[in-house]
Protein backbone atom coordinates (compact mmCIF):
# COMPACT_ATOMS: atom_id res chain seq x y z
CA UNK A 1 0.00 0.00 0.00
CA UNK A 2 1.02 3.60 -0.42
CA UNK A 3 2.53 5.57 2.44
CA UNK A 4 1.23 9.06 3.05
CA UNK A 5 3.33 12.16 2.58
CA UNK A 6 1.84 15.34 3.93
CA UNK A 7 2.01 19.02 3.13
CA UNK A 8 -0.07 22.08 3.89
CA UNK A 9 -1.82 24.25 1.35
CA UNK A 10 0.65 26.83 0.06
CA UNK A 11 3.73 24.77 0.94
CA UNK A 12 5.94 22.78 -1.37
CA UNK A 13 5.34 19.02 -1.23
CA UNK A 14 8.19 16.52 -1.54
CA UNK A 15 7.75 12.96 -2.82
CA UNK A 16 10.94 10.88 -2.54
CA UNK A 17 12.19 8.57 -5.27
CA UNK A 18 15.76 7.48 -5.93
CA UNK A 19 17.85 5.05 -7.91
CA UNK A 20 21.58 4.47 -8.23
CA UNK A 21 22.85 4.83 -11.81
CA UNK A 22 25.07 1.97 -12.95
CA UNK A 23 27.75 4.55 -13.77
CA UNK A 24 27.91 8.35 -13.49
CA UNK A 25 25.80 9.84 -16.25
CA UNK A 26 24.38 6.44 -17.19
CA UNK A 27 20.81 7.53 -16.54
CA UNK A 28 17.56 5.60 -16.72
CA UNK A 29 14.33 7.23 -17.96
CA UNK A 30 11.96 8.16 -15.15
CA UNK A 31 8.40 9.42 -15.25
CA UNK A 32 6.15 10.94 -12.61
CA UNK A 33 2.39 10.84 -13.01
CA UNK A 34 -0.71 11.56 -10.99
CA UNK A 35 -2.50 8.31 -10.26
CA UNK A 36 -1.33 4.79 -9.42
CA UNK A 37 1.35 3.42 -11.75
CA UNK A 38 -0.29 1.66 -14.69
CA UNK A 39 1.23 -1.28 -16.55
CA UNK A 40 3.22 1.00 -18.85
CA UNK A 41 4.80 4.41 -18.25
CA UNK A 42 2.90 6.87 -16.04
CA UNK A 43 -0.65 8.11 -16.27
CA UNK A 44 -1.25 11.87 -16.39
CA UNK A 45 2.47 12.53 -16.76
CA UNK A 46 3.68 15.62 -14.91
CA UNK A 47 7.42 15.15 -15.45
CA UNK A 48 9.66 12.86 -17.48
CA UNK A 49 13.39 12.37 -17.80
CA UNK A 50 15.35 10.48 -20.43
CA UNK A 51 18.93 9.21 -20.52
CA UNK A 52 20.24 12.77 -20.56
CA UNK A 53 17.86 15.36 -19.21
CA UNK A 54 14.40 16.33 -18.05
CA UNK A 55 12.53 16.25 -21.35
CA UNK A 56 8.99 17.03 -20.20
CA UNK A 57 7.61 18.91 -17.24
CA UNK A 58 4.55 20.88 -16.26
CA UNK A 59 4.33 24.00 -14.15
CA UNK A 60 4.84 23.58 -10.38
CA UNK A 61 6.46 20.14 -10.77
CA UNK A 62 10.24 19.88 -10.66
CA UNK A 63 13.20 17.83 -9.53
CA UNK A 64 15.01 19.65 -6.76
CA UNK A 65 17.71 17.02 -6.26
CA UNK A 66 20.53 15.92 -8.53
CA UNK A 67 18.69 13.65 -10.93
CA UNK A 68 22.00 12.84 -12.65
CA UNK A 69 22.94 11.00 -9.46
CA UNK A 70 19.59 9.25 -9.30
CA UNK A 71 17.66 11.62 -7.03
CA UNK A 72 14.40 11.89 -8.96
CA UNK A 73 12.31 13.04 -5.99
CA UNK A 74 9.42 15.25 -7.06
CA UNK A 75 8.76 18.69 -5.65
CA UNK A 76 5.29 20.16 -6.15
CA UNK A 77 5.28 23.89 -5.68
CA UNK A 78 2.62 25.82 -3.77
CA UNK A 79 0.22 22.92 -3.33
CA UNK A 80 -3.55 23.14 -3.17
CA UNK A 81 -6.10 20.62 -1.91
CA UNK A 82 -6.51 19.46 -5.51
CA UNK A 83 -2.94 18.11 -5.45
CA UNK A 84 -3.97 15.37 -3.01
CA UNK A 85 -3.86 11.85 -4.33
CA UNK A 86 -1.56 9.06 -5.44
CA UNK A 87 1.55 9.84 -7.49
CA UNK A 88 3.56 7.33 -9.48
CA UNK A 89 7.34 7.37 -9.73
CA UNK A 90 8.44 4.90 -12.39
CA UNK A 91 12.08 4.05 -12.98
CA UNK A 92 12.10 2.68 -16.51
CA UNK A 93 14.90 0.11 -16.37
CA UNK A 94 15.78 -1.34 -19.78
CA UNK A 95 14.55 -4.82 -20.56
CA UNK A 96 11.16 -6.43 -20.67
CA UNK A 97 9.12 -5.16 -17.74
CA UNK A 98 12.04 -4.47 -15.45
CA UNK A 99 10.55 -1.15 -14.34
CA UNK A 100 10.40 -0.25 -10.66
CA UNK A 101 7.06 1.32 -9.71
CA UNK A 102 6.45 3.39 -6.59
CA UNK A 103 3.03 4.69 -5.61
CA UNK A 104 3.19 7.58 -3.13
CA UNK A 105 0.14 9.14 -1.52
CA UNK A 106 0.12 12.89 -1.00
CA UNK A 107 -2.25 14.31 1.58
CA UNK A 108 -2.75 18.06 1.55
CA UNK A 109 -3.99 19.65 4.74
CA UNK A 110 -5.56 23.10 4.98
CA UNK A 111 -3.07 25.75 6.03
CA UNK A 112 -2.93 26.41 9.77
CA UNK A 113 -3.74 29.97 10.68
CA UNK A 114 -0.98 30.93 13.11
CA UNK A 115 0.16 34.34 14.28
CA UNK A 116 3.84 33.60 13.70
CA UNK A 117 5.24 31.93 10.58
CA UNK A 118 6.27 28.33 11.20
CA UNK A 119 9.34 26.82 9.62
CA UNK A 120 8.44 24.42 6.84
CA UNK A 121 9.54 20.90 7.62
CA UNK A 122 12.69 19.92 5.79
CA UNK A 123 11.55 16.71 4.14
CA UNK A 124 14.97 16.15 2.61
CA UNK A 125 16.36 15.57 6.09
CA UNK A 126 13.80 12.89 6.77
CA UNK A 127 14.43 9.23 6.18
CA UNK A 128 12.10 7.83 3.52
CA UNK A 129 12.66 4.09 2.98
CA UNK A 130 11.56 1.84 0.22
CA UNK A 131 11.26 -1.91 0.46
CA UNK A 132 11.40 -3.61 -2.89
CA UNK A 133 10.37 -7.06 -3.95
CA UNK A 134 12.58 -8.38 -6.70
CA UNK A 135 11.48 -11.07 -9.08
CA UNK A 136 9.62 -11.62 -12.32
CA UNK A 137 7.53 -8.77 -13.60
CA UNK A 138 6.96 -5.36 -12.05
CA UNK A 139 8.16 -4.97 -8.50
CA UNK A 140 5.86 -4.61 -5.57
CA UNK A 141 6.99 -1.78 -3.40
CA UNK A 142 6.06 -0.40 -0.06
CA UNK A 143 7.24 2.87 1.33
CA UNK A 144 7.70 3.06 5.06
CA UNK A 145 7.44 6.80 4.99
CA UNK A 146 9.46 9.50 6.65
CA UNK A 147 11.30 8.39 9.74
CA UNK A 148 13.10 11.43 11.15
CA UNK A 149 15.71 11.10 13.89
CA UNK A 150 16.12 7.39 13.31
CA UNK A 151 19.13 5.74 14.89
CA UNK A 152 21.09 2.59 14.03
CA UNK A 153 19.33 0.55 16.73
CA UNK A 154 15.98 1.46 15.24
CA UNK A 155 17.18 0.53 11.76
CA UNK A 156 18.42 -2.81 13.04
CA UNK A 157 15.15 -3.46 14.87
CA UNK A 158 13.18 -2.49 11.80
CA UNK A 159 15.23 -4.86 9.66
CA UNK A 160 14.70 -7.71 12.13
CA UNK A 161 10.96 -7.12 12.25
CA UNK A 162 10.73 -7.12 8.48
CA UNK A 163 13.14 -9.92 7.67
CA UNK A 164 10.37 -12.43 7.07
CA UNK A 165 8.18 -10.07 5.08
CA UNK A 166 8.03 -10.72 1.34
CA UNK A 167 8.30 -6.98 0.87
CA UNK A 168 11.54 -6.80 2.80
CA UNK A 169 14.06 -8.06 0.29
CA UNK A 170 15.94 -4.84 0.11
CA UNK A 171 16.27 -2.51 3.08
CA UNK A 172 18.74 0.19 2.08
CA UNK A 173 20.53 2.87 4.07
CA UNK A 174 20.40 5.48 1.33
CA UNK A 175 16.69 6.18 1.14
CA UNK A 176 14.32 4.86 -1.50
CA UNK A 177 17.09 3.58 -3.69
CA UNK A 178 17.06 1.22 -6.62
CA UNK A 179 20.49 0.06 -7.73
CA UNK A 180 20.84 -0.26 -11.49
CA UNK A 181 23.40 -2.62 -13.01
Amino acid sequence: SEVEYRAEVGQNAYLPCFYTPAAPGNLVPVCWGKGACPVFECGNVVLRTDERDVNYWTSRYWLNGDFRKGDVSLTIENVTLADSGIYCCRIQIPGIMNDEKFNLKLVIKPAKVTPAPTRQRDFTAAFPRMLTTRGHGPAETQTLGSLPDINLTQISTLANELRDSRLANDLRDSGATIRIG
Epitope: P38, V39, E41, R52
Partner: antibody
Framework: QMQLQQSGPGLVKPSQTLSLTCAIS??????????WNWIRQSPSRGLEWLGR?????????AFAVSVKSRITINPDTSKNQFSLQLNSVTPEDTAVYYC??????????????WGQGTLVTVSS | EIVLTQSPASLSVSLGETVTIECRAS??????LAWYQQKPGKSPQLLIY???SLHTGVPSRFSGSGSGTQYSLKINSLQSEDVASYFC?????????FGQGTKVEIK
Protein backbone atom coordinates in the same frame (compact mmCIF):
# COMPACT_ATOMS: atom_id res chain seq x y z
CA GLN B 1 -8.72 12.11 -37.58
CA MET B 2 -6.31 9.39 -36.49
CA GLN B 3 -6.55 6.21 -38.55
CA LEU B 4 -4.69 2.91 -38.65
CA GLN B 5 -4.70 0.91 -41.88
CA GLN B 6 -3.46 -2.68 -41.75
CA SER B 7 -2.01 -4.71 -44.59
CA GLY B 8 -0.45 -8.14 -44.99
CA PRO B 9 -1.21 -11.68 -46.08
CA GLY B 10 -4.15 -13.58 -44.65
CA LEU B 11 -2.58 -17.01 -45.05
CA VAL B 12 0.74 -18.15 -43.63
CA LYS B 13 2.24 -21.63 -43.66
CA PRO B 14 3.30 -23.29 -40.40
CA SER B 15 6.92 -22.56 -39.34
CA GLN B 16 6.98 -19.45 -41.55
CA THR B 17 6.91 -15.80 -40.50
CA LEU B 18 3.72 -13.78 -40.14
CA SER B 19 4.27 -10.17 -41.30
CA LEU B 20 1.77 -7.34 -40.98
CA THR B 21 2.08 -3.59 -41.42
CA CYS B 22 0.07 -0.76 -39.87
CA ALA B 23 0.07 2.60 -41.67
CA ILE B 24 -0.66 5.63 -39.47
CA SER B 25 -2.49 8.73 -40.64
CA UNK B 26 -3.28 11.75 -38.49
CA UNK B 27 -0.41 11.08 -36.11
CA UNK B 28 3.30 10.29 -36.09
CA UNK B 29 4.81 6.92 -35.25
CA UNK B 30 7.54 8.82 -33.39
CA UNK B 31 5.09 10.80 -31.27
CA UNK B 32 6.44 11.33 -27.75
CA UNK B 33 3.07 10.56 -26.19
CA UNK B 34 1.77 7.59 -28.17
CA UNK B 35 2.55 3.88 -28.13
CA TRP B 36 1.86 1.44 -30.95
CA ASN B 37 0.57 -2.04 -30.19
CA TRP B 38 -0.32 -5.34 -31.73
CA ILE B 39 -3.21 -7.30 -30.24
CA ARG B 40 -4.81 -10.47 -31.53
CA GLN B 41 -8.18 -12.12 -31.05
CA SER B 42 -9.15 -15.74 -31.47
CA PRO B 43 -12.12 -17.80 -30.29
CA SER B 44 -9.88 -20.00 -28.15
CA ARG B 45 -7.74 -17.31 -26.50
CA GLY B 46 -9.91 -14.20 -26.70
CA LEU B 47 -8.15 -10.84 -26.89
CA GLU B 48 -4.41 -11.10 -26.29
CA TRP B 49 -1.90 -8.25 -26.10
CA LEU B 50 1.29 -9.09 -28.00
CA GLY B 51 3.56 -6.07 -27.69
CA ARG B 52 4.17 -2.37 -28.18
CA UNK B 53 6.79 0.02 -29.48
CA UNK B 54 7.10 3.68 -28.57
CA UNK B 55 9.42 6.65 -28.85
CA UNK B 56 10.58 8.65 -25.82
CA UNK B 57 13.79 10.31 -27.03
CA UNK B 58 14.70 6.85 -28.33
CA UNK B 59 12.80 3.71 -29.29
CA UNK B 60 11.59 1.21 -26.70
CA UNK B 61 9.51 -1.93 -26.89
CA ALA B 62 7.77 -4.43 -24.63
CA PHE B 63 6.33 -7.83 -25.42
CA ALA B 64 4.11 -10.53 -23.98
CA VAL B 65 6.11 -13.34 -22.43
CA SER B 66 4.14 -15.86 -24.47
CA VAL B 67 5.60 -14.56 -27.76
CA LYS B 68 8.72 -12.63 -26.76
CA SER B 69 11.14 -15.12 -28.34
CA ARG B 70 9.31 -14.93 -31.69
CA ILE B 71 8.09 -11.34 -32.02
CA THR B 72 9.53 -8.20 -33.57
CA ILE B 73 7.76 -4.84 -33.74
CA ASN B 74 9.55 -2.28 -35.87
CA PRO B 75 8.69 1.37 -36.47
CA ASP B 76 9.33 2.86 -39.92
CA THR B 77 9.56 6.63 -39.55
CA SER B 78 10.04 7.26 -43.27
CA LYS B 79 6.69 5.65 -44.07
CA ASN B 80 5.01 6.55 -40.76
CA GLN B 81 4.08 2.96 -40.03
CA PHE B 82 5.00 0.04 -37.81
CA SER B 83 5.11 -3.66 -38.44
CA LEU B 84 4.66 -6.99 -36.72
CA GLN B 85 6.76 -10.05 -37.41
CA LEU B 86 5.93 -13.32 -35.67
CA ASN B 87 8.32 -16.15 -36.43
CA SER B 88 7.81 -19.92 -36.42
CA VAL B 89 4.02 -19.72 -36.50
CA THR B 90 1.75 -22.65 -35.73
CA PRO B 91 -2.01 -23.09 -36.21
CA GLU B 92 -2.37 -21.74 -32.65
CA ASP B 93 -1.37 -18.33 -34.03
CA THR B 94 -4.48 -18.22 -36.24
CA ALA B 95 -6.35 -15.08 -35.16
CA VAL B 96 -7.55 -11.64 -36.14
CA TYR B 97 -4.57 -9.31 -35.64
CA TYR B 98 -5.14 -5.65 -34.73
CA CYS B 99 -2.74 -2.76 -34.64
CA UNK B 100 -3.66 -0.20 -32.03
CA UNK B 101 -2.67 3.14 -30.51
CA UNK B 102 -2.54 3.97 -26.81
CA UNK B 103 -1.75 7.20 -25.02
CA UNK B 104 -4.38 9.65 -26.27
CA UNK B 105 -5.69 10.74 -22.88
CA UNK B 106 -2.35 10.80 -21.09
CA UNK B 107 -2.79 7.25 -19.79
CA UNK B 108 -1.09 4.14 -21.08
CA UNK B 109 -2.01 0.49 -21.26
CA UNK B 110 -5.39 0.65 -22.98
CA UNK B 111 -6.29 1.38 -26.57
CA UNK B 112 -7.97 4.45 -28.06
CA UNK B 113 -7.69 3.60 -31.73
CA TRP B 114 -7.75 0.23 -33.46
CA GLY B 115 -6.90 -0.87 -36.98
CA GLN B 116 -9.54 -2.69 -38.98
CA GLY B 117 -8.11 -6.11 -38.16
CA THR B 118 -6.55 -8.76 -40.36
CA LEU B 119 -7.59 -12.38 -40.19
CA VAL B 120 -4.43 -14.46 -40.41
CA THR B 121 -4.84 -18.20 -40.90
CA VAL B 122 -1.89 -20.49 -40.30
CA SER B 123 -2.34 -23.54 -42.45
CA SER B 124 -0.42 -25.62 -44.94
CA GLU C 1 -0.78 -12.47 -14.76
CA ILE C 2 -4.04 -10.91 -13.65
CA VAL C 3 -7.11 -12.88 -14.71
CA LEU C 4 -10.32 -11.00 -15.49
CA THR C 5 -13.59 -12.92 -15.17
CA GLN C 6 -16.63 -11.37 -16.83
CA SER C 7 -20.22 -12.24 -16.04
CA PRO C 8 -22.55 -13.10 -17.51
CA ALA C 9 -21.12 -14.61 -20.68
CA SER C 10 -24.23 -13.51 -22.56
CA LEU C 11 -27.55 -11.89 -21.84
CA SER C 12 -30.72 -11.09 -23.71
CA VAL C 13 -32.41 -7.81 -22.79
CA SER C 14 -35.40 -5.81 -23.98
CA LEU C 15 -34.89 -2.40 -25.54
CA GLY C 16 -34.99 0.37 -22.95
CA GLU C 17 -33.88 -1.88 -20.10
CA THR C 18 -30.72 -1.44 -18.05
CA VAL C 19 -27.79 -3.80 -18.55
CA THR C 20 -25.06 -4.43 -15.98
CA ILE C 21 -21.93 -6.42 -16.81
CA GLU C 22 -19.49 -7.44 -14.11
CA CYS C 23 -15.72 -7.84 -14.33
CA ARG C 24 -13.79 -9.42 -11.45
CA ALA C 25 -10.00 -9.22 -11.28
CA SER C 26 -7.87 -11.89 -9.60
CA UNK C 27 -6.13 -9.13 -7.62
CA UNK C 28 -6.49 -5.41 -6.95
CA UNK C 29 -6.04 -3.40 -10.16
CA UNK C 30 -6.43 0.05 -8.60
CA UNK C 31 -9.01 1.30 -11.14
CA UNK C 32 -6.71 0.43 -14.05
CA LEU C 33 -9.65 -0.90 -16.03
CA ALA C 34 -11.06 -0.15 -19.48
CA TRP C 35 -14.26 -1.31 -21.18
CA TYR C 36 -14.62 -1.91 -24.92
CA GLN C 37 -17.57 -2.51 -27.22
CA GLN C 38 -17.12 -4.80 -30.23
CA LYS C 39 -19.83 -5.11 -32.85
CA PRO C 40 -19.86 -8.20 -35.08
CA GLY C 41 -17.09 -8.09 -37.69
CA LYS C 42 -15.69 -4.83 -36.33
CA SER C 43 -12.75 -3.73 -34.18
CA PRO C 44 -13.26 -3.06 -30.49
CA GLN C 45 -14.05 0.54 -29.49
CA LEU C 46 -13.11 2.17 -26.20
CA LEU C 47 -16.01 3.10 -23.93
CA ILE C 48 -14.59 3.63 -20.43
CA TYR C 49 -11.09 4.04 -18.98
CA UNK C 50 -9.78 4.41 -15.43
CA UNK C 51 -12.81 2.35 -14.35
CA UNK C 52 -15.26 5.24 -14.58
CA SER C 53 -14.09 7.86 -17.12
CA LEU C 54 -16.23 8.08 -20.24
CA HIS C 55 -14.22 8.16 -23.47
CA THR C 56 -14.83 11.12 -25.77
CA GLY C 57 -17.91 10.68 -27.96
CA VAL C 58 -19.35 7.75 -26.01
CA PRO C 59 -23.06 8.19 -25.14
CA SER C 60 -23.77 9.04 -21.52
CA ARG C 61 -25.98 5.97 -21.10
CA PHE C 62 -22.73 4.04 -20.64
CA SER C 63 -21.09 4.26 -17.23
CA GLY C 64 -18.39 2.40 -15.35
CA SER C 65 -17.92 1.88 -11.64
CA GLY C 66 -16.06 -0.22 -9.12
CA SER C 67 -12.77 -0.45 -7.28
CA GLY C 68 -10.32 -3.01 -5.99
CA THR C 69 -11.15 -6.26 -7.76
CA GLN C 70 -14.81 -5.66 -8.65
CA TYR C 71 -15.91 -3.50 -11.58
CA SER C 72 -19.04 -3.08 -13.63
CA LEU C 73 -20.29 -1.54 -16.86
CA LYS C 74 -23.83 -0.22 -16.91
CA ILE C 75 -25.88 0.58 -20.02
CA ASN C 76 -28.97 2.60 -19.19
CA SER C 77 -31.93 2.28 -21.54
CA LEU C 78 -30.47 -0.21 -23.99
CA GLN C 79 -30.64 0.85 -27.65
CA SER C 80 -30.60 -1.43 -30.70
CA GLU C 81 -27.12 -0.15 -31.66
CA ASP C 82 -25.79 -1.45 -28.32
CA VAL C 83 -26.04 -5.05 -29.53
CA ALA C 84 -22.39 -6.13 -29.30
CA SER C 85 -19.84 -7.95 -27.20
CA TYR C 86 -18.30 -6.06 -24.29
CA PHE C 87 -14.81 -6.65 -22.94
CA CYS C 88 -13.02 -5.41 -19.84
CA UNK C 89 -9.24 -4.95 -19.83
CA UNK C 90 -6.86 -4.31 -16.94
CA UNK C 91 -3.79 -2.14 -17.42
CA UNK C 92 -2.48 -2.06 -13.88
CA UNK C 93 -0.07 -4.99 -14.11
CA UNK C 94 1.99 -6.71 -16.79
CA UNK C 95 0.83 -8.04 -19.13
CA UNK C 96 -2.37 -6.17 -20.01
CA UNK C 97 -5.15 -8.75 -19.97
CA PHE C 98 -8.75 -8.89 -21.19
CA GLY C 99 -11.92 -10.48 -19.94
CA GLN C 100 -13.48 -13.19 -22.07
CA GLY C 101 -16.37 -10.94 -23.13
CA THR C 102 -20.10 -10.57 -22.60
CA LYS C 103 -22.46 -10.81 -25.56
CA VAL C 104 -25.51 -8.53 -25.33
CA GLU C 105 -28.53 -9.36 -27.50
CA ILE C 106 -32.03 -7.94 -27.84
CA LYS C 107 -34.86 -10.05 -26.44
Amino acid sequence: QMQLQQSGPGLVKPSQTLSLTCAISGDSVSSNSAAWNWIRQSPSRGLEWLGRTYYRSKWYSAFAVSVKSRITINPDTSKNQFSLQLNSVTPEDTAVYYCAREGSSGWYGYVHHWGQGTLVTVSS
Amino acid sequence: EIVLTQSPASLSVSLGETVTIECRASEDIYNGLAWYQQKPGKSPQLLIYNANSLHTGVPSRFSGSGSGTQYSLKINSLQSEDVASYFCQQYYDYPPTFGQGTKVEIK
